[in-house]
Interface confidence: medium
Amino acid sequence: MQKGDQNPQIAAHVISEASSKTTSVLQWAEKGYYTMSNNLVTLENGKQLTVKRQGLYYIYAQVTFCSNREASSQAPFIASLCLKSPGRFERILLRAANTHSSAKPCGQQSIHLGGVFELQPGASVFVNVTDPSQVSHGTGFTSFGLLKL
Amino acid sequence: MQKGDQNPQIAAHVISEASSKTTSVLQWAEKGYYTMSNNLVTLENGKQLTVKRQGLYYIYAQVTFCSNREASSQAPFIASLCLKSPGRFERILLRAANTHSSAKPCGQQSIHLGGVFELQPGASVFVNVTDPSQVSHGTGFTSFGLLKL
Amino acid sequence: MQKGDQNPQIAAHVISEASSKTTSVLQWAEKGYYTMSNNLVTLENGKQLTVKRQGLYYIYAQVTFCSNREASSQAPFIASLCLKSPGRFERILLRAANTHSSAKPCGQQSIHLGGVFELQPGASVFVNVTDPSQVSHGTGFTSFGLLKL
């Protein structure tokens, strides 16, 4: 699976984890059918994917959530893919927004984010949502990953 | 387009096909603007993409469907990306769920799934939906593919 | 970041730009956290990504929009990923459709498109939507890109 000793494959796919924390940052785990190619990408503190090598990466996240218009705030459910590199400000790379469903008790919706970005050594990417309590953690519903081009 | 004789590009993109079968597994065809890089990935029985080489693959599917809350079951429309490896149980890799629309006669919605997974030689991936009769087969609406990293 | 002199990395990620033009083709810019790997892929006229080398490309687009059922046409919001190759007719590669929300003044929804396609030298890809005035241009909401396998 090596591209060569100097250019190993770097890829990760991690699985959502329910969390009692009130933070808007989603939690992830190396469980189920996860991918962690080698130590050039790591899952840190269960919340961010950190890369050791500079380069172009395709980064993606999928979030399934269940919400109801009446029970939620006026604002839509937003999922954000964020980047923090050493010596750089936190940046939003991608966002998706879905207005809450009128279905009761809640209506499920899925969001997919993905794009190609330049990452520096030590850069971390993570996923923020407006309301983590609405996220669905059933098998396959919510995941996060990247691959180095 | 070769990475080298030992490491050829492997990729596929197939197009949805309406089916009279009552199975929940979607049917696909090599038609329209499809991709099939070589015989290291094949479309089998019109329903699964099968790979010959072990490795990391980015696998994706897009499903557009049209449904109505009153005419559908209470359960949401769910699309699942599934894996069957030789000698292993079938497993769900990714799922997305969308509650049915209140629009009449039906409301269209699109789901996108994608992630990086390790596949064994002879592994097959396929797409399940809760109600195949609701899937839209117009040009470009529903497709399925993969690429080897 | 080179795969080798003969096989450089080719990738792009561009950011949506609001436009006063009435055309259904979305406008893009090299701004914010964009990617343009080298001159083997270019953004032309702010509307299309053009590649110089033949090969397989993973092409994607994300469109977030805000619409209301009563204020919109009966037809759903459709985003289309289109291809124009030299000497060939324009063709649709991918489409996604979402019925307008009943939320007021409008309900936000996000669409993601992505797939692997063979592109010829000089081929251009672009994104069409049914109503560009409904597209959301806030940070990260709407973007377009590709990567060469």
Partner: nanobody
Framework: EVQLLESGGGLVQPGGSLRLSCAAS????????MGWVRQAPGKGLEWVSD????????YYADSVKGRFTISRDNSKNTLYLQMNSLRAEDTAVYYC????????????????WGQGTLVTVSS
């Protein structure tokens, strides 16, 4: 030791212009995103603008968009803030700040600040 030294502040009439400078030392300036933050009398800190390490990408608070321009000269290790069409509400101490080396979630945006330069907009 990291040092950030602001200059260029002063008294200016409404509608006037000023250019603030920030001389950086003690770190590799060209490797860091930089920003400007201000504190009006009796108020909290307000982010004004920031710029990426190569000067490619800039961001502005809505309150200054179209009037202020952030820039940098990596060869001179200097950050700038050009302020045009100044208003009374722009009166504040302006601080130059360096992006934090921390990574990940809930990290501080800045880790080093200058001493600040006072801008007073008054007729």
């Amino acid at each position: 030791e990291v040092q950030l030294l602001e200059s260029g502040g002063g008294l200016v009439q409404p509608g006037g212009s000023l250019r603030l400078s920030c001389a950086a030392s003690g770190f590799t300036f060209s490797h860091y995103d930089m920003g400007w933050v201000r504190q009006a009398p009796g108020k909290g800190l307000e982010w004004v603008s920031d710029i990426d390490y190569i000067g490619k990408t800039t961001y502005y608070a809505d309150s200054v968009k179209g009037r202020f321009t952030i820039s940098r000269d990596n060869s001179k290790n200097t950050l700038y803030l050009q302020m045009n069409s100044l208003r009374a509400e722009d009166t504040a101490v302006y601080y130059c700040a360096k992006a934090s080396d921390e990574v990940g979630v809930n990290t501080s945006k800045f880790d080093y600040w200058g001493q600040g330069t006072l801008v007073t907009v008054s007729s």
